[in-house]
């Protein structure tokens, strides 16, 4: 089963910015541009989906202008010549304010969402598959540009039978307490390729890292516990962390922590003594409010193997256990790249970790 990973995001790129869209645009690709409109200089900024770096061929020019009450221009440029402008005379951006700008490529059009509301659809004037570059210029500061690959793979029954290079997909967020979710989420990002697979040599306590190749699925020697490793580059939208192991027969609790300095950005704490999966954040040694709700019964079982997939998105972490989406945990610590340490401890035996 071939699997195409999502492109790694561009983090805090300087403006003006031009970057390659790996594999070009494809139907279902979602591109998120997250940043802040500068309050001082300039009255315009633009996001361009173009061919090459010259700027002569722009399939989609998205151009907010803080002029004449504010409006947004959409256009296409072919061989250096602009076509007729499409203007939206409403301004969803505010000077000095952050924004969340999301583009969805579809067969007939680009759909653009700004701050959670569909803002405009722009019908293709040129074939979108020609686009291989995104550029941003003007009065804006960027936090990141991320990509969510449209390709998905079927939901697997459990990771334990599947190499991690073929991960499951998150189904849609469960919406009722009774029904199962209706299928595979269509815009699911795949784990990116800059992963590190942590394996263990026969000498206890020694670890080495290998490139992201499909790991052999033979039993590994046990990982040292507690297990601590660095997450290279920290978290960012589309980043995945994969773990598998076995719960000890007499287990009371275990934890998976994603840490930022002295803070625990995400504490995943299955508790067999309470039949609960507790999630929380600890900042300056102070715990926040616990989250415990689950769409189904406790997925971890004493004495049984398990797999956990943690997928980072812009607003939240999505967590799947044994190939089934379990919950979302919305970021309480927002500086994602600083969340760069994984700690696992408690009553389990780890068999595989991929960061």
């Amino acid at each position: 089963m071939a699997f195409s990973g999502s492109q790694a995001p561009y983090l805090s790129p300087a403006v003006p910015f031009s970057g390659t869209i790996q594999g070009g645009l494809q139907d279902g690709l979602q591109i998120t541009v997250n940043g802040t409109v500068l309050s001082s200089s300039g009255t315009r900024f633009a996001v361009n989906f173009q061919t090459g770096f010259s700027g002569n061929d722009i399939a989609f020019h998205f151009n907010p202008r803080f002029e004449d009450g504010g409006y947004v221009v959409c256009n296409t440029r072919q061989n250096g010549s602009w076509g007729p402008e499409e203007r939206k005379t409403h301004m969803p951006f505010q000077k000095g304010m952050p924004f969340d700008l999301c583009f969805l490529v579809q067969s007939s059009d680009f759909k653009v969402m700004v701050n959670g509301i569909l803002f405009v659809q722009y019908f293709h004037r040129v074939p979108f598959h020609r686009v291989d570059t995104i550029s941003v210029n003007g009065s804006v500061q960027l936090s990141y540009i991320s990509f969510q690959n449209p390709r998905t793979v079927p939901v697997q029954p459990a990771f334990s039978t599947v190499p991690f290079s073929q991960p499951v997909c998150f189904p849609p967020r469960p919406r009722g307490r009774r029904q199962k979710p209706p299928g595979v989420w269509p815009a699911n990002p795949a784990p990116i390729t800059q992963t590190v697979i942590h394996t263990v040599q026969s000498a206890p306590g020694q670890m080495f890292s290998t490139p992201a190749i499909p790991p052999m699925m033979y039993p590994h020697p046990a990982y040292p516990m507690p297990f601590i490793t660095t997450i290279l580059g920290g978290l960012y939208p589309s980043k995945s962390i994969l773990l598998s192991g076995t719960v000890l027969p007499s287990a009371q609790r275990f934890h998976i922590n994603l840490c930022s300095g002295n803070h625990i950005a995400f504490h995943l704490n299955p508790r067999f003594d309470e039949n609960a999966v507790v999630r929380n954040t600890q900042i300056d040694n102070s715990w926040g409010s616990e989250e415990r709700s689950l769409p189904r019964k406790m997925p971890f079982v004493r004495g049984q193997s398990f797999s956990v997939w943690i997928l980072c998105e812009a607003h939240c972490l999505k967590v799947a256990v044994d190939g089934q989406h379990l919950f979302e945990y919305y970021h309480r610590l927002r500086n994602l790249p600083t969340i760069n340490r994984l700690e696992v401890g408690g009553d389990i035996q780890l068999t595989h970790v991929q960061t």
Epitope: H90, P98, F99, K111, M113, N115, G116, F119, V120, A187
Partner: antibody, heavy 122, light 109 residues
């Protein structure tokens, strides 16, 4: 379990002020847009305002612009609607609702509060 | 503003009937339309999102469709618990990014 609970409604005189609260549990308000929708007695639904706490963006219906202010306190996981210069026509049940967090490309308000009644009368 | 013109404003039907409610948007709103059911004294409940997707837990007799700027909610076989008021809602950014239809009250014949 996701829940939204409104409070702060009551009887107020024309020209007066009220602050409505929408306490969220089961999710964080910073993860989604939060909307206020009202319904006058015997009438239909009217959208009032929304906030996208992740970016701080706010938007208002023309009928309340300049009088109402929507805000969110992410540490308290609560959204607010500050209503000033209230008029008789603002009398309604006010609901807060969450826009779906299922995917950015899903359109619908999936969870609503039970509503709080605001009566503007002398 | 984008107007959502909903029709009919009310209808009488019997259990087992097929019921169709329509909303016409005054301009293109893509598929950014939802349908809600509201019963007296209660908050609205989401039935259909993104024009045609059935919300989890909603019976399959409810369906939504889109044709251009026309949106339709269909109840294939009306049940006693379906007597309520139904609203369409668009969320396509305009001066008011959210607007509701006027509502359709479905009553027992």
């Amino acid at each position: 379990e996701v829940q939204l609970v409104e409070s702060g409604g009551g009887l107020v005189q024309p020209g007066g002020s009220l602050r409505l609260s929408c306490a969220a549990s089961g999710f964080t308000v910073s993860s989604s847009s939060i909307h206020w929708v009202r319904q006058a007695p015997g009438k239909g639904l009217e959208w009032v305002a929304y906030i996208y706490p992740y970016s701080g963006y706010t938007s208002y219906a023309d009928s309340v612009k300049g009088r109402f202010t929507i805000s969110a306190d992410t540490s308290k996981n609560t959204a607010y609607l500050q209503m000033n210069s209230l008029r008789a026509e603002d009398t309604a049940v006010y609901y807060c609702a969450r826009y779906s967090t299922y995917s950015k490309w899903v359109w619908g308000m999936d969870y609503w509060g039970q509503g709080t009644l605001v009566t503007v009368s002398s | 503003d984008i107007q959502m013109t909903q029709s009919p404003s009310s209808l009488s039907a019997s259990v087992g009937d097929r019921v169709t409610i329509t909303c016409r948007a005054s301009q293109s709103v893509s598929s950014a339309v939802a349908w809600y059911q509201q019963k007296p004294g209660k908050a609205p409940k989401l039935l259909i999102y993104s024009a045609s997707s059935l919300y989890s837990g909603v019976p399959s007799r409810f369906s939504g469709s889109r044709s251009g700027t026309d949106f339709t909610l269909t109840i294939s076989s009306l049940q006693p618990e379906d007597f309520a008021t139904y609203y369409c809602q668009q969320s396509y950014y305009d001066s008011n990014p959210i607007t509701f239809g006027q509502g359709t009250k479905v009553e027992i014949k």
